[in-house]
Amino acid sequence: KSPVFGPQEVSSVEGNSVSIKCYYPPTSVNRHTRKYWCRKGASGRCITLVSSEGYVSSNYAGRANLTNFPENGTFVVNIAQLSRDDSGHYKCGLGINSRGLSFDVSLEVSQGPELPNGTEVYTVDVGRTVTIKCPFKTENAPKTKALYKKIGQTSVLVIDSRNYVNPNYKDRIRLRIPGTGQLIFTVVIDRLRLSDHGLYLCQAGDGSNRDEKNADLQVLEPEPELVYEDLRGSVTFHCALGLEVANVAKFLCRVNSRETCDVVINTLGKRDSAFEGRILLNPQDKDGSFSVVITGLRKEDEGRYLCGAHSDGQLQEGWPIQAWQLFVNEESTIPRSPTVVKGVAGGSVAVLCPYNPKESQSLKYWCLWEGAQNGRCPLLVESQGLVQEQYEGRLSLLQEPGNGTFTVILNQLTTQDAGFYWCLTNGDTRWRTTVEIKIIEGEPNLKVPGNVTAVLGETLNIPCHFPCKFSSYEKYWCKWSNTGCQTLPSQDEGPSEAFVNCDENSRLVSLTLNPVTRADEGWYWCGVKQGHFYGETAAVYVAVEEKKVAGSRYVSPAKADAAPDEKVLDSGVREIENKAIQDPRLFAEEKVVADTGDQAGGSRASVDSSSSEEQGGSSK
């Protein structure tokens, strides 16, 4: 039995289109093999009409195509301008026509309903606008023009040129009579409803000389587009509703079991709390189109979504909509990473951000989700080294551990840092993820001086105290710059058994700058890591001043001043609109922190993690 499945019977009418979906098990082989649509002949052979390799038979030229959707094991054959000659037996299949996996489909094209001669057919989506054209002869130019709807054997007046409007069409219909010489009037119906579907009759004049024209109006509900995304990943709904609603409030809603539609987000500021921190409504273009991005997809996000336009910011009958059916794949390619990371005031967090491992060269970004209005995500840092000014000295994006994960470190935490952050790249948009930073009670594990003033030409030692639980971790000092944090050369770390036993006197790693130069001014981080995985960090700012007194200077935590005040951002720094999320190259204008000079190098800077006694200080 073939695992390929589709509709056994498809019926339609002349002039119409069909869209035949065939389903197959989405194994790796099936996804990439040839897909075909062929017609069975009397001889039993099946002649290819269209295939996924681009072949289209002459009979189908310009009216058919085959589209494969490998991620969800579907391919679709669209055939337009059907004629009765298209009736017959077909196969949709994979591989070779004669011996591949296939499914039999019977297509029947009939003449269609008996419409009055000369009937014009209008096919329009619900919520859109239709313009019905009604010709008339010169002698009927001064006479009454009208549009009727045929319901069974009766005709119901819809609108006429004497200002009558049927209540069912109130505020959404108009009859236009052109200037002299043009022998056609038009009826425009906006915000079409399903109930508008049917046969209409245009009439000009009365009696035996009247002009009549039939119009068949077919109002279609939008076919939901299948969207198949990975758990923990991201989805983007692109919504293009047309210029006629460009200035009307927009929304995205999710259909519930009662068949009503709950607003997920709209341009009037409403947002479902279930999507807090993981949704953005990108500003609309001039044509009224907009998009909604949802990250951190959960199984419960599955469902039918509609986007639309209405002044109330929610679904109303007869307004244009677009539909999607979202399926969330639990066999996700996106690795699990913490959705909540906790840090203490004054401490730090190291956030692991997944990206598509096939895109190791892509630019990496980290932005702060802001919920105001439609939501936006101003960039804080990127892998090329741009960092927003108020994060100078306390934020860094590292390419490690690599192979599908990068790391973002944020230290000197305050309660203001609590919130939602997004990890993204300029590559695969489905890999956007969200992490929430929570600030909890507690003390930082790493202790460094608040700030340090070093004297030009002298020696500076900066201690960093760590608790026993970090004894097996690698300790490091690095000099922060807007392009990362350059690890400083390390001296011999002293007897290793001191760390194994976690001797009271060994819980110290010190940075030595000798001699201090102007280039040494800036931020330094003390940190712990395990291999390529970063743990806590602590930051200290070193200011350099002219020599006042001779001798080396040792700074212990007791003598350290308070941390320097954060630099205040000048109001000219542009906030990044959500739109930039679509194309991270738009971030290039973001204000850049001035480079903090040459890295401390050579033997001038060294890290020493021998005991604090040897440094001539004490450690609590």
Epitope: F5, V10, S11, V18, G112, L194, L220, E223, R304, Q325
Partner: nanobody, 126 residues
């Protein structure tokens, strides 16, 4: 939500025929797959047939065992879907359910718990 009410079940001898009806209310079901499923005691519900339509095009889906014997159809004006079952066999004995779901993806799966009828019993005796 779509309310679905099945009828037409009953007792019939092998080779006989039955016509099941599924009346939908609550909204028009033009954007839905309307499916028939069946269930025998201790077993999972299994797909029998489904129908969908877009404008004046109709798509009918059947399981292998139903092909050639069962016909699914609809009456738009009555918002009703039918399953004409001919050449019935004892193995067709089951409770038959009508179900509805948005017209997207494979019509054999992912029917929402809310959009099922209460079922109608079909018994085929030899």
């Amino acid at each position: 939500q779509v309310q679905l009410v099945e009828s037409g079940g009953g007792w019939v001898q092998t080779g006989g025929s039955l016509r099941l009806s599924c009346a939908a209310s609550g909204r028009t079901v033009s954007s839905y797959y309307m499916g028939w499923f069946r269930q025998t005691p201790g077993k999972e519900r299994e797909f029998v047939a489904a129908i969908s339509w877009v404008g004046s095009s109709t798509y009918k889906y059947y399981t292998d065992s139903a092909k050639g014997r069962f016909t699914i159809s609809r009456d738009n004006a009555k918002n009703t879907v039918y399953l004409q079952m001919n050449s019935l066999k004892p193995e067709d004995t089951a409770v038959y359910y009508c179900a509805a779901r948005p017209r997207v993806g494979d019509p054999r799966s992912r029917y929402d718990d809310d959009n099922w009828g209460q079922g109608t019993q079909v018994t085929v005796s030899s």
